[in-house]
């Protein structure tokens, strides 16, 4: 079996002021089974925006029902972007562990870029 | 840390209905299905039913369509099976299990609650 | 429905040696290039455990003398060196449709 790839297509989005985010992310296999989160910006200090497991994300809808059997689609939306939520996104799999889950494979990032709204 | 907690014990009525619960924590209930297992004293595994939290669709195995029901309380993170009009052949221990990889499989379990049915 | 019958019913192996449980289904567990079928282990008096994913990738915390192979209607679960806690019942299940499991084979250790 090859082993899993986390794919973030889009290198950018530009998205303005007020509206919805799209960041796209899917895998390549089933294999490891273990849970999907976002983060803003790489290293110890990224921001945690959405995390499969647990926790609660507000301003975050995903793409696909993650229940869905065999999901591989983990995109999300992030709603009334604002400029301050530039930056890249990073989506990272993380492998089940025992007690904690242990990160496994990043995609390569998606910048995303906010277009202030005409005044 | 995943848990599912189960009562251990009830005692039932022939005839009686009884409703098992499993109450989630450490993770998202809505996001991953929750497994209902038979076990009868000495006896195998046997799969009765699963549902998807975040909008109550149910499989069933057809042997145990007309005898489980499932049901969940997102409020409480608590899943449900309701066991209907009952007989000696009901009494076994009841898991509830967790997929924590949309694979149909069952990851993390409850301890089970031991029903028995008796006069 | 998809049968999956398991043998031997029993066993019982020297500490030591290699434990090796067979799971036939009925028809092919088989889809788009995975094997839907998982190994549980179950001791007395507690819920099953989780093994092996997928016919052959170990589940976390599981120790690397635990291992699955198969493919198509014919699965093999071994553990070598068998160790004394290795005795308890182990299932198959498979979800290629809805889940079942096999009857279980319980290993005994000598």
């Known amino acids: 079996e090859e082993e899993l790839q986390v794919i973030q297509p889009d290198k950018s989005v530009l998205v303005a002021a007020g509206e919805t985010a799209t960041l796209r992310c899917t895998v390549t296999s089933l294999i490891p089974v273990g849970p999907i989160q976002w983060f803003r910006g790489a290293g110890p200090g990224r921001e945690l925006i959405y995390n499969q497991k647990e926790g609660h994300f507000p301003r975050v809808t995903t793409v696909s029902d993650s229940t869905k059997r065999n999901n591989m689609d983990f995109s999300i939306r992030i709603g009334n972007i604002t400029p301050a939520d530039a930056g890249t996104y990073y989506c990272v799999k993380f492998r089940k562990g025992s007690p904690d889950d242990v990160e496994f494979k990043s995609g390569a990032g998606t910048e995303l870029s906010v277009r202030a709204k005409p005044s | 840390q995943v848990q599912l907690q189960q009562p251990g014990t009830e005692l039932v009525r022939p005839g009686a209905s009884v409703k098992l619960s499993c109450k989630a924590s450490g993770y998202t209930f809505t996001n991953y299905w929750i497994n209902w297992v038979k076990q009868r004293p000495g006896q195998g595994l046997e799969w009765i039913a699963m549902i998807d939290p975040s909008d109550s669709e149910t499989h069933y195995n057809q042997i145990f369509k007309d005898k489980a029901t499932l049901t969940v309380d997102k409020s409480s993170n608590t899943a449900y099976m309701q066991l209907s009009s009952l007989t000696s052949g009901d009494s076994a221990v009841y898991y509830c299990?967790?997929?924590?990889?949309?694979?149909?499989?069952?990851?993390?379990w409850g301890r089970g609650t031991s029903v028995t049915v008796s006069s | 429905d998809i049968v999956l019958t398991q043998s031997p019913a029993s066993l019982a192996v020297s500490l030591g040696q290699r434990a090796t449980i067979s799971c036939r289904a009925s028809k092919s567990v088989s889809s788009s290039g995975y094997n839907y079928i998982f190994w549980y282990q179950q001791k007395p008096g507690q819920p099953p455990k989780l093994l092996i994913y997928?016919?052959?990738n170990l589940d976390s915390g599981v120790p690397a003398r635990f291992s699955g192979s198969g493919s198509g209607t014919d699965f093999t679960l071994n553990i070598h060196p068998v160790e004394e806690e290795d005795a308890a019942t182990y299932y198959c299940?498979?979800?290629?449709?809805?889940?079942?499991f096999g009857g279980g084979t319980k290993l005994e250790i000598k």
């Open positions: 299990a967790m997929d924590y990889g949309s694979l149909y499989a069952m990851d993390y």
């Open positions: 299940q498979h979800s290629r449709e809805l889940p079942t």
């Open positions: 997928l016919a052959s």
